[in-house]
């Protein structure tokens, strides 16, 4: 039976949420963000084998065409299905303020 | 000046909409779709260099971390930003029906 969450490549090899520890300098934010000084960035990393966490019909099509024409059509890609919001304390023209960003941290992942 | 739509790799090399001509057999649909017999599949293909069609803040983060840790963090990926709906005439248990799919054909592309 098809199982969209069982990785045929082995544990942890397929599309899933990873956490990467990054400084403001790593992120290129040091000139406009004051806090936090470090971020636990959640992002989607891993392979997208056939039928694994397919986001939609388009992902199915893409996988089928990739198998037929691998040099023309790439395999589906592991990307965020949704995001967790996060606040940054940032410098602006008018001073320092708290800003909420809705699209900073991946919440869960799928293959598109 | 930054230009999110100018491809630094040369014309047509960066993330954009491509059309791939496919039969029902190519798509693996021959056993459940009656019409159309061929589909002009629009999909997103191409590289995602820095600042090119970045979908959101997450894409910027991913690119910055990819440059720092290319073996750990992949580059952003070219995926649909939106879809065009399409109707399929399909076989069902009770006969034939027309079904609209909202997520079959990519309408435009961005890097995530």
């Amino acid at each position: 039976a098809r199982n969209g969450d069982r990785c045929p490549l082995g544990p942890g090899r397929c599309c899933r949420l990873h956490t990467v520890h990054a400084s403001l300098e790593d992120l290129g934010w040091a000139d406009w963000v004051l806090s936090p000084r470090e971020v636990q960035v959640t992002m989607c990393i891993g392979a997208c084998p056939s039928q694994f966490r397919e986001a939609n019909m388009h992902a199915q099509i893409k996988m089928n065409l990739h198998r037929l024409k691998p040099d023309t059509v790439p395999a589906p890609c592991c990307v965020p299905a949704s995001y967790n919001p996060m606040v940054l304390i940032q410098k602006t023209d008018t001073g320092v303020s708290l800003q909420t960003y809705d699209d900073l941290l991946a919440k869960d992942c799928h293959c598109v | 000046a930054r230009n999110g739509d100018r491809c630094p790799l040369g014309p047509g090399r960066c993330c954009r909409l491509h059309t791939v001509h496919a039969s029902l057999e190519d798509l693996g649909w021959a056993d459940w779709v009656l019409s159309p017999r061929e589909v002009q599949v629009t999909m997103c293909i191409g590289a995602c260099p820095s600042q090119f069609r970045e979908a959101n803040m997450h894409a910027q983060i991913k690119m910055n971390l990819h440059r720092l840790k290319p073996d750990t963090v992949p580059a952003p990926c070219c995926v649909p930003a939106s879809y065009n709906p399409m109707v399929l005439i399909q076989k069902t248990d009770t006969g034939v029906s027309l079904q609209t799919y909202d997520d079959l054909l990519a309408k435009d592309c961005h890097c995530v």
């Epitope: 004051l34 806090s35 606040v87 304390i89 | -």
Partner: antibody, heavy 118, light 107 residues
Framework: QVTLKESGPGILQPSQTLSLTCSFS??????????VSWIRQPSGKGLEWLAH???????RYNPSLKSRLTISKDTSSNQVFLEITSVDTADTATYYC??????????WGQGTTLTVSS | DIVMTQSQKFMSTSVGDRVSVTCKAS??????VAWYQQKPGQSPKGLIY???YRYSGVPDRFTGSGSGTDFTLTISNVQSEDLAEYFC?????????FGGGTKLEIK
């Protein structure tokens, strides 16, 4: 817009437990980096930070009062709570709840006054 | 705990003058210092974050400076509405601590 409002008993007797509620609106305590602190100020004196609760339920306390303090939250009802056990006259003060993004205090409540008296 | 010392409890100044409120940390806190203004009968309000950055909407006559252990809040062209108490605070490490406050009186 962002608002925070503290509520409490007003008057307590020594050795009783103080229960404070901070009701807020205009932001969510589910967002990464968001938090709420409790800070108190005896009349005519300085500010004392008591406790902080983060979006992920991480809690921080002032060590000088830690054994008496409990901070908690109810994100669905947009409330943060502080309990102080065994109050004494030294706990007489105005208690403020304050919104903080990470360590950036940007919105303060109007404060609620507690008097401890026998 | 890090002790924040505001040695001057009271300062007197005149409208139009320039005044500097100082704050000393008992150990290095980098630039992790904020300043707050509390007018009589009101809640405190943020003025300066990260030692030198004004909160959004704070007039530019308020300036913060310093790093390590010595910090200064300078008010240039003092206005009558600046009558208030000013507190420094460190957020470099827990417990977050405040200075004792400096009351600004307008002559």
């Amino acid at each position: 817009q962002v608002t925070l409002k503290e509520s409490g008993p007003g008057i307590l007797q020594p050795s009783q437990t103080l229960s404070l509620t901070c009701s807020f609106s205009g932001f969510s305590l589910t967002i990464s980096g968001m938090g709420v602190s409790w800070i108190r100020q005896p009349s005519g004196k300085g500010l004392e930070w008591l406790a902080h609760i983060y979006w992920d339920d991480d809690k921080r306390y002032n060590p000088s009062l830690k054994s008496r303090l409990t901070i908690s939250k109810d994100t669905s009802s947009n409330q943060v709570f502080l309990e102080i056990t065994s109050v004494d006259t030294a706990d007489t003060a105005t208690y403020y709840c304050v919104r903080a993004g990470w360590d950036f205090f940007d919105y303060w409540g109007q404060g609620t006054t507690l008097t401890v008296s026998s | 705990d890090i002790v924040m010392t505001q040695s001057q409890k009271f300062m007197s100044t005149s409208v139009g003058d320039r005044v500097s409120v100082t704050c000393k940390a008992s150990q290095n806190v980098g630039t992790n210092v904020a300043w707050y203004q509390q007018k009589p009968g009101q809640s405190p309000k943020g003025l300066i974050y990260s030692a030198s950055y004004r909160y959004s909407g704070v007039p530019d006559r308020f300036t913060g400076s310093g790093s390590g252990t010595d910090f200064t809040l300078t008010i240039s062209n003092v206005q009558s509405e600046d009558l208030a108490e000013y507190f420094c605070q460190q957020y470099n490490s827990y417990p977050w601590t405040f200075g004792g406050g400096t009351k600004l009186e307008i002559k």
